[in-house]
């Protein structure tokens, strides 16, 4: 029977700069029941705080709701593991909410084949930003990436769409069924998961781009 091993805070993520969650990996348990607590202070403060919510983010997590989340403030956090034989502490982790945003995937991806009379046909897609993100505040610039592939192909073809919420693709294989997905990331932060796949059947008479 030993004191617990050193825990590690391995990830902090925010969906929208308004709330965030951090997760830790326990160290070895020393063969005894172990309690974990996350404490933090904000840079410039010495007032120590405890995690306000150990439930929302699941096991070994601390969730910071709206009232605990400050933009422009660096959080300095540490996890304490304690059992009957002693304690151990994680390294301090410095967290700035601005840099840990991982949005939800974009919504309402729609894909259509457009066949104008006077131009080459193309695949047109549009989508909406995730609902948790309020782009009107100007706090966010969201960038988008699209990927698509024929249903049976192994390789994805990826296109960067910048800040647009619509995109055209000209080069497609006629008669194929395509899977299309979109994802987004803030200017500072992490890519979202890919949106659910949307399927589109390319007509056999679709003319390939020269």
């Amino acid at each position: 029977q030993l004191p617990p091993g050193k825990p590690e805070i391995f990830k902090c993520r925010s969906p929208n700069k308004e709330t965030f969650t951090c997760w830790w990996r326990p160290g070895t348990d020393g063969g005894l029941p172990t309690n974990y607590s996350l404490t933090y202070h904000r840079e410039g403060e010495t007032l120590m705080h405890e995690c306000p919510d150990y439930i929302t983010g699941g096991p070994n997590s601390c969730h910071f709701g709206k009232q605990y989340t400050s933009m422009w403030r660096t959080y300095v956090m540490m996890v304490n593991a304690t059992n009957q034989m002693g304690s151990s502490f994680s390294d301090e982790l410095y967290v700035d909410v601005t840099y840990i945003v991982q949005p939800d995937p974009p919504l309402e991806l729609t894909v259509e084949v457009k066949q104008p009379e006077d131009r080459k046909p193309y695949l047109w897609m549009k989508w909406s930003p995730p609902t948790l993100i309020d782009l009107k505040t100007g706090w966010f610039t969201l960038l988008y990436e699209i990927r698509l592939k024929p249903e049976k192909a192994a390789e994805w073809e990826t296109h960067f769409a910048g800040q647009q919420t619509e995109f055209k693709i000209l080069s497609l294989h006629p008669g194929q069924k395509y899977l299309v997905q979109v994802r987004c990331k803030p200017d500072h932060g992490y890519w979202s998961a890919w949106s659910p796949a949307t399927f589109i059947q390319i007509p056999s008479d679709f003319i390939m781009n020269d």
Partner: antibody, heavy 118, light 107 residues
């Protein structure tokens, strides 16, 4: 409605003891850090104690250190202040105050009066 | 411990006047400063935090400024309902010290 209600004040002799209670309702008490602030008659506000959400971190003002104890019972949504070795200068209205997530007192109770006199 | 000094300790001004209260910290506290209003016989009420962020529901005639050691609370146009004592408070570390208060009255 978010509310804090203090009780337990009264008249006590110097050297005596008193326990103040603060009952919280309308919010998730266990997620918030809590404080006691007092105000002597005709005087300003004086912060006297802080307790973190699960009770692991506690701070006291020098004026009460060693005489007063702050503690909480999250199951009962209650905050307490055990006051021992009371002095005349402890006479004041005692407020419990919720510390918001950005460390300011956003909700206050109505206060309970403590009078220390022989 | 860091001391918070408010000035003036009291002032009298006319309705519509611009009123400024100052608060000085004995050491730098970044912008970890709040202002509270306490009307006679009432409980203190939060006005401003992070030195300049207006608490929800507080009239826009109240504003805060400053950083480091020197801070101000300004009432742009004094109203009869603003008669109160105003307190600054630092909250970057314990003790969470209040200033001595400034009593604002109407002439």
């Amino acid at each position: 409605e978010v509310q804090l209600v203090e009780s337990g004040g009264g008249l006590v002799q110097p050297g005596g003891s008193l326990r103040l209670s603060c009952a919280a309702s309308g919010f998730t008490f266990s997620s918030y850090e809590m404080n006691w602030v007092r105000q002597a008659p005709g005087k300003g506000l004086e912060w006297i104690s802080y307790i973190s959400s699960r009770g692991g971190t506690i701070y006291y003002a020098d004026s009460i250190k060693g005489r007063f104890t702050i503690y909480r019972d999250n199951a009962r949504n209650s905050l307490y202040l055990q006051m021992n070795s009371l002095r005349a200068e402890d006479t004041a209205i005692y407020y419990c105050a919720r510390l918001s997530g950005v460390d300011i007192f956003d909700i206050w109770g109505q206060g309970t009066m403590v009078t220390v006199s022989s | 411990d860091i001391q918070m000094t408010q000035s003036p300790s009291s002032l009298s001004a006319s309705v519509g006047d611009r009123v400024t209260i100052t608060c000085r910290a004995s050491q730098g506290i970044s912008n970890y400063l709040a202002w509270y209003q306490q009307k006679p016989g009432k409980v203190p009420k939060l006005l401003i935090y992070f030195a300049s962020t207006l608490q929800s529901g507080v009239p826009s005639r109240f504003s805060g400024g400053g950083s480091g050691t020197d801070f101000t609370l300004t009432i742009s146009s004094l109203q009869p309902e603003d008669v109160a004592t105003y307190y600054c408070q630092r909250y970057n570390s314990a003790p969470l010290t209040f200033g001595g208060g400034t009593k604002v009255e109407i002439k």
